[in-house]
């Protein structure tokens, strides 16, 4: 039995949030990634990738970049200038269709204060495309990319998962992934 | 409770190799990404290498590309270093961590396993 | 890669007194830095995540702050077992995860 507990993240306005999520290369290479943030029951998708996914490629919804990484099996999440109102519950998932998705690790609990960050967020914003090429024994990324494209996305799609989110998530049975059901 | 204990320290002459362990419990192995720290004596903390959870890529610290090599046995809930070509420098206490959330700190130590390399 | 610069070396604070660490990146790191303690011949512990996040299990005297490129740990009232060693690690973007050379905080 697996049981997914959420990670907490404390952050002040304006910083930045960044979580790696990792997938099977074998199974997901090829598949769209999402950034979710859970509302009540319902998951609301915020941003998602291409398909098929490119390296060093991001995808850009407002605040919000998703990276995928096919290679490593990564996936790169970035949300920068963080306010007060994010706060919640987020998930990295696969999307492989609107009326299902897969949860990848485990969930995220942001909780944004206000309050000095140290740094204003706007000027992290220098550092965010700026990426190291990494040390690994798994192919290595494409050239870097020299321009990223900003993709439009449509609003939000909402599905309904069939968990409650409480202080604490415990999701059992669970292998690699989760399937969450949606209904329409 | 989660538990990492490293074994396969020892000495060992430069050029030879040894591969050290890190068994764990206490929590789901396969999902984490773990990492190799070491600490030469009386010195600060190095990064030696990861291997990632569901993924499986490795990275390693430049310091010991091409002669370590990190795997994990997820049947055994165990994670290995391979050190070969080993030099006096390699020589420090060795650590196994397991790496928090999807971030690459870590929230869980081993008590270290030494390694010394000397002729 | 990104070297972490802290300073100062040794920081000799006496007990109750309050202790501030700093820590410095080459390039910025946004908000992915991380502390730990260290006491002799043990393995490190994780306080201090995601620049400002306390670890589970640890004190509030513990504080981070800082973005970027600078960052602080601040203990706020020292306690007998806070004396050792403390690392900050930045986990920004891709390996190699680097560490400070470490402050020690010794008894005044």
């Known amino acids: 039995t697996t049981e997914l507990t959420e990670e907490k993240y404390e952050y002040k306005e304006g910083q930045t949030l960044e979580v790696k999520c990792d997938y099977a290369l074998e199974k997901y290479a090829n598949s769209r990634k999402a950034w979710q943030k859970m509302e009540g029951k319902m998951p609301k998708i915020l941003a998602k990738t291409e398909r098929p996914s490119e390296n060093s490629h991001p995808v850009q919804v407002g605040r919000i970049t998703l990276e995928d990484y096919p290679d490593h099996g990564l996936l790169q999440v970035r949300m920068t200038n963080l306010q007060v109102e994010d706060s919640g519950l987020y998930q990295c998932v696969i999307y492989q269709h609107p009326k299902e998705s897969h949860v990848l690790f485990n969930p995220i609990c942001l909780v944004v204060t206000k309050g000095s960050s140290g740094t204003p967020g706007s000027s992290e914003n220098s550092t965010q495309n700026v990426y190291r090429t990494p040390s690994t024994t798994a192919k290595a990324l494409g050239p870097r990319y020299t321009s990223p494209r900003t993709v439009t996305q449509a609003p939000p799609e909402s599905t309904v998962v069939v968990s409650t989110p409480g202080s604490e998530i415990n999701l059992t049975n669970v292998t690699d992934i989760i399937r969450v059901p949606v209904f329409n | 409770e989660v538990q990492l204990l490293e074994s396969g320290g020892g000495m060992v002459q430069p050029g030879g190799s040894l591969r050290l362990s890190c068994a764990v419990s206490?929590?789901?192995?396969?999902?984490?990404?773990m990492s190799w720290v070491r600490q030469a004596p009386g010195k600060g903390l190095e990064w030696v290498s990861e291997?990632?959870?569901?993924?499986?890529?490795?990275y390693y610290a430049d310091s010991v590309k091409g002669r370590f090599t990190i795997s994990r046995d997820n049947s055994k809930n165990t994670l290995y270093l391979q050190m070969n070509s080993l030099r006096v420098e390699d020589t420090a206490i060795y650590y196994c961590?397991?790496?928090?959330?999807?971030?690459?700190?870590?929230?869980?130590w081993g008590q270290g396993t030494l390694v010394t390399v000397s002729s | 890669e990104i070297v972490m610069t802290q300073s100062p070396a040794t920081l000799s604070v006496s007990p109750g007194e309050r202790a501030t660490l700093s820590c410095r990146a080459s390039?910025?790191?946004?908000?992915?830095l991380a502390w730990y303690q260290q006491k002799p011949g043990r393995a490190p512990r994780l306080l201090i995540y995601?620049?400002?996040t306390r670890a589970t299990g640890i004190p509030a005297r513990f504080s981070g702050s800082g973005s970027g490129t600078e960052f602080t740990l601040t203990i706020s009232s020292l306690q007998s077992e806070d004396f050792a060693v403390y690392y900050c690690?930045?986990?920004?973007?891709?390996?190699?995860?680097?560490f400070g050379q470490g402050t020690k905080v010794e008894i005044k």
């Open positions: 390039q910025s790191v946004n908000s992915n």
């Open positions: 291997m990632r959870g569901s993924s499986g890529s490795t």
């Open positions: 690690q930045q986990f920004y973007n891709w390996p190699p995860w680097t």
């Open positions: 995601g620049a400002s």
């Open positions: 961590a397991k790496e928090f959330s999807s971030n690459s700190l870590f929230d869980y």
């Open positions: 206490g929590f789901t192995f396969s999902r984490y990404a």
